[in-house]
Interface confidence: medium
């Protein structure tokens, strides 16, 4: 539930938010938190945030990691704080890639 006391508050979680979609905020609230990593123009792009409606994250969170994108989802307040999504390496590195946090 949302806070400790009430029985009728939406079950939303506070999530760490990092990336362009966050604007000036460092947090967001939703039914699921996520941490993602994708390769965009040779850069590793890390993002964190939330899915406000459970259905939004249902497909995304169930998608297995691919060489180009990985998303990890969780439910719980600030649960994505210490999660860093990882791409499957299969013993290979991606030449010319750099780590890059979208701000």
């Amino acid at each position: 539930m949302e806070d400790e006391k009430p029985k009728v508050n939406p079950k939303l979680y506070m999530c760490v938010c990092e990336g362009l979609s966050c604007g000036n905020e460092d947090h967001c609230e939703g039914q699921q938190c996520f941490s993602s990593l994708s390769i965009n123009d040779g850069f590793h792009v890390y993002q964190k945030g939330c899915f406000q409606v459970y259905e939004q994250g249902k497909m995304t969170c169930k998608t297995p990691p691919s060489p180009g994108q990985a998303v990890e989802c969780c439910q719980g307040d600030w649960c994505n704080r210490n999660i860093t999504a990882q791409l499957p390496t299969k013993g290979k590195s991606f030449p010319g890639t750099q780590n890059f946090h979208l701000e």
Partner: antibody, heavy 115, light 106 residues
Framework: EMQLVESGGGLVQPGGSLKVSCAAS????????IHWVRQASGKGLEWIGR??????????AYAASVKGRFTISRDDSKNTAFLQMSGLKTEDTAVYYC??????WGQGTLVTVSS | DIQMTQSPSTLSASVGDRITITCRAS??????LAWYQQKPGKAPKLLIY???SLEGGVPSRFSGSGSGTDFTLTISSLQPDDFATYYC????????FGQGTKVEIK
């Protein structure tokens, strides 16, 4: 006895502003999210928005009908929450309730928007 | 936004009747649904939360059921004090209320 008491309602002209208060007694408001719900005469209940507690960064959310016009805030040291209304329209005329969820509801305060 | 559709809007019944009010959500809300009773000039009173959990002090003649998108409030034997307006409320994503069902004396 646990209760919430709203105050600050009254008559305001269209386009005007008003700040309604919600004071708690008998329990600590700071533990809970505070929601505001309104009810026009003879109509149903409409959720306006809410403010979460300190551990949740006092996050606010609003119904589309009031977003950008209404602001919810709280002062935990005074055990009070507030609803600041601006750009008021005649259709905002209603009884405004605050609630901490469960059976913690105020008695409501009437806001009338009319010229 | 999640929409809540309640039916009927008015229900005429007699003391002792068993009545059922239904509520439908525009998308799945699991069991994050509450039922309220409201009397004229008074604030709403919580009867049921989490679709079927009875709030403390509420008579056992009130019961709720359902999950996903379809929910019901049942009063097993209507009492004089039960003539009022009833609202369903989803709290899966913020709050939305149904339009209300007025239970009146037949």
């Amino acid at each position: 006895e646990m209760q919430l008491v709203e105050s600050g309602g009254g008559l305001v002209q269209p386009g005007g502003s008003l700040k309604v208060s919600c004071a708690a007694s008998g329990f600590t408001l700071s533990d809970s999210s505070i929601h505001w719900v309104r009810q026009a005469s003879g109509k149903g209940l409409e959720w306006i928005g809410r403010i979460r507690s300190k551990p949740y960064s006092y996050a606010t959310a609003y119904a589309a009908s009031v977003k950008g016009r209404f602001t919810i805030s709280r002062d935990d040291s005074k055990n009070t929450a507030f609803l600041q209304m601006s750009g008021l329209k005649t259709e905002d005329t209603a009884v405004y309730y605050c609630t901490g969820g469960d059976d913690f509801w105020g008695q409501g305060t009437l806001v009338t928007v009319s010229s | 936004d999640i929409q809540m559709t309640q039916s009927p809007s008015t229900l005429s019944a007699s003391v002792g009747d068993r009545i059922t009010i239904t509520c439908r959500a525009s998308q799945s809300i699991s069991t994050w649904l509450a039922w309220y009773q409201q009397k004229p000039g008074k604030a709403p009173k919580l009867l049921i939360y989490k679709a079927s959990s009875l709030e403390g002090g509420v008579p056992s003649r009130f019961s709720g059921s359902g999950s996903g998108t379809d929910f019901t409030l049942t009063i097993s034997s209507l009492q004089p004090d039960d003539f009022a307006t009833y609202y369903c409320q989803q709290y899966n994503t913020y709050w939305t209320f149904g339009q209300g069902t007025k239970v009146e004396i037949k």
